[in-house]
């Protein structure tokens, strides 16, 4: 495929990545699918620099990121290593709380109102952020 050298319309460029910020809410899986259909992924936060950038744009609103533990261990959707990577959990989080009465625990991570992270029920309709890297090959086949 061809390389993406600039961000799509309505996406924001920052440090060689493009970001799209939703204004509505979706369940985590639906948000994840939305980003994939845009040839992107839910945002993967790898540094304080990126945390500050995303936090700035989402404001004090619960917002999904590309981190989940639906299959056991915590995993970033792009394969970034969780154990050695950047983390910004709220105190005593993640706690996989079962007391919400919605069945199961809490398997999806989101930004809270102060930017720090919490795990929550994946079905909650939160806003989300998509990310795609500049200079990566797009998935579209080349024109013949």
């Amino acid at each position: 495929g061809s390389e993406r050298t600039c961000c799509p319309v309505n996406w924001v460029e920052h440090e060689r990545s493009c970001y799209w910020f939703s204004r509505s809410g979706k369940a985590w899986a639906d948000a994840d699918n939305y980003c994939r259909l845009e040839d992107a992924h839910l945002v993967v936060v790898t540094s304080w620099e990126e945390q500050k950038f995303v936090q700035h744009h989402i404001g004090p609103v619960n917002t999904w990121m590309g981190l989940h533990d639906q299959n056991g261990p915590w995993k970033w959707v792009d394969g970034t290593d969780y154990e050695t990577g950047f983390k910004n959990w709220r105190p005593e989080q993640p706690d996989d709380w079962y007391g919400h009465g919605l069945g199961g625990g809490e398997d999806c991570a989101h930004f809270t109102d102060d930017g720090r992270w919490n795990d929550d029920v994946c079905q909650r309709p939160y806003r989300w952020v998509c990310e795609t890297e500049l200079d990566k090959a797009s998935q579209e086949p080349p024109l013949l």
Partner: antibody, heavy 119, light 106 residues
Framework: QITLKESGPTLVKPTQTLTLTCTFS??????????VGWIRQPPGKALEWLAL???????RYSPSLKSRLTITRDTSKNQVVLTMTNMDPVDTATYYC???????????WGQGTLVTVSS | SYELTQPPSVSVSPGQTASITCSGD??????ACWYQQKPGQSPVLVIY???KRPSGIPERYSGSNTGNTATLTISGTQAMDEADYYC?????????FGGGTKLTVL
């Protein structure tokens, strides 16, 4: 070349509503990450941020003034409008509009317009 | 609401290094930027994203932001640097300005 210019009344009576217009050129308020903000500065005092509107129509307000402020945009006219209700003499200040993109801070400013609140 | 605190004034001799501080709770977790304002003029952005310089700003202007303090450093200070300096941070997507620091070049 990015330019911004504020316009509006120079004198407002107490309790009246102030309407200021920021007319800009050199950028589009439809471009991802772009925003236009309003900042004021009373004579001899510090800068105070008032409001900000982004490319996606996301609006942000100073918590202490939120109930009095409304920010809107007209992308076809390249204008951003700030309204401030219930004006008081302590609101006398130079009002600036400024451009921002992503998290750069306010990188281009208008010349400012002095608004005096007096009966 | 979030507050940023700056010293009201800082004095420096020509050619020396001036440091202006800006303090706020967990400021290092937010973006900080700095503005220079001379009498009768609009503010000018001199540092953004903690440490980046816009084009046209001399290299002697630098910034840092860690813990609870952001610092603007002007090395080899010149008479033309005499001005008011304001820090600004983004808190929960709203902007906050410090009270300003008057830099005097003796």
């Amino acid at each position: 070349q990015i330019t911004l210019k504020e316009s509006g009344p120079t004198l407002v009576k107490p309790t009246q509503t102030l309407t200021l217009t920021c007319t800009f050129s050199g950028f589009s308020l439809s471009t991802g990450g772009v925003g236009v903000g309003w900042i004021r500065q009373p004579p001899g005092k510090a800068l105070e941020w008032l409001a900000l509107i982004y490319w996606n129509d996301d609006k942000r307000y100073s918590p202490s003034l939120k109930s009095r402020l409304t920010i809107t945009r007209d992308t076809s006219k390249n204008q951003v409008v700030l309204t401030m209700t219930n004006m008081d003499p302590v609101d006398t200040a130079t009002y600036y509009c400024a451009h921002t993109i992503a998290v750069r801070g306010f990188d281009y400013w208008g010349q400012g317009t002095l608004v005096t609140v007096s009966s | 609401s979030y507050e940023l605190t700056q010293p009201p004034s800082v004095s420096v001799s020509p050619g020396q290094t001036a440091s202006i501080t800006c303090s706020g709770d967990k400021l290092g977790e937010k973006y900080a930027c700095w503005y220079q304002q001379k009498p009768g003029q609009s503010p000018v952005l001199v540092i953004y994203q903690d440490r980046k310089r816009p084009s046209g700003i001399p290299e002697r202007y630098s910034g840092s932001n860690t813990g609870n303090t952001a610092t603007l450093t002007i090395s080899g200070t010149q008479a033309m640097d005499e001005a008011d300096y304001y820090c600004q941070a983004w808190d929960s997507s709203t902007a906050v300005f410090g009270g300003g620091t008057k830099l005097t070049v003796l």
